[in-house]
Amino acid sequence: LQDPCSNCPAGTFCDNNRNQICSPCPPNSFSSAGGQRTCDICRQCKGVFRTRKECSSTSNAECDCTPGFHCLGAGCSMCEQDCKQGQELTKKGCKDCCFGTFNDQKRGICRPWTNCSLDGKSVLVNGTKERDVVCGPSPADLSPGASSVTPPAPAREPGHSPQ
């Protein structure tokens, strides 16, 4: 015998109190699959959360974070404070990036400026708290009389990583 509840579509529940009739989900509840015996309570996006998508009879509400915060985790389970560019979030709140580091986003940590010399290049534009340095051509390319044509790259010996 087929379970009569299996005929109940999403947005309804199988009401045992009414001879297993498919009843619509009550307000502020939903069922996202058929054959449900109960409807789930809709998530409420309050406080630090705000509603990104309203709850419907077939799908839960979706939250994001109020301005000044950003979502963490699947389904925006928590919110983390935003900082300004050029800052990072510490245990004592937002702090400016230390000299030699930058953060170009409202979240995340300050990262060290690129070391241009490791790539044999010079610094074209200095770094700031908000921006990484911009590396330019190698110092040799900038010397007077240097050819503007880039010479072919020398063949690398096996086992050596590129410069």
Partner: nanobody, 128 residues
Framework: EVQLVESGGGLVQPGGSLRLSCAAS????????MGWVRQAPGKGREFVSA????????YYADSVKGRFTISRDNSKNTLYLQMNSLRAEDTAVYYC?????????????????????WGQGTQVTVSS
């Protein structure tokens, strides 16, 4: 055994100040996001403020922003709520709550279902 014990409530005149404390025990305090929730007579719960496990992220309800300050001392396993410029509408029972999850050291939540543990509450009455 997990315990959250609030203290510091009382009767205060409008414009006055109080500092609530919540002493926690029985869990790794710094791993838990903490919150202060209040309930006035005949009204629903209102999330007043929340703070992440490491203390970097704080949230305040619009109704208390600029007047209340949440803080925590992880070395003392204690949560605080400094309440200044108190108003009659701040009269309520204040509860502290603790919840943990993957991001609770750096994030906050104002969803009551996130919080695993609740204190018994402390009464704050603002009246002249």
């Amino acid at each position: 055994e997990v315990q959250l014990v609030e203290s510091g409530g009382g009767l205060v005149q409008p414009g006055g100040s109080l500092r609530l404390s919540c002493a926690a025990s029985g869990f790794t305090f710094s791993s838990y996001a903490m919150g202060w929730v209040r309930q006035a007579p005949g009204k629903g719960r209102e999330f007043v403020s929340a703070i992440s496990g490491y203390g970097g992220t704080t949230y305040y309800a619009d109704s208390v922003k600029g007047r209340f300050t949440i803080s925590r001392d992880n070395s003392k396993n204690t949560l605080y709520l400094q309440m200044n410029s108190l108003r009659a509408e701040d009269t309520a029972v204040y509860y502290c709550a603790a919840g943990t999850g993957y991001y609770s050291r750096v994030g906050v939540s104002t969803d009551p279902s996130f919080y695993d543990y609740w204190g018994q509450g402390t009464q704050v009455t603002v009246s002249s």
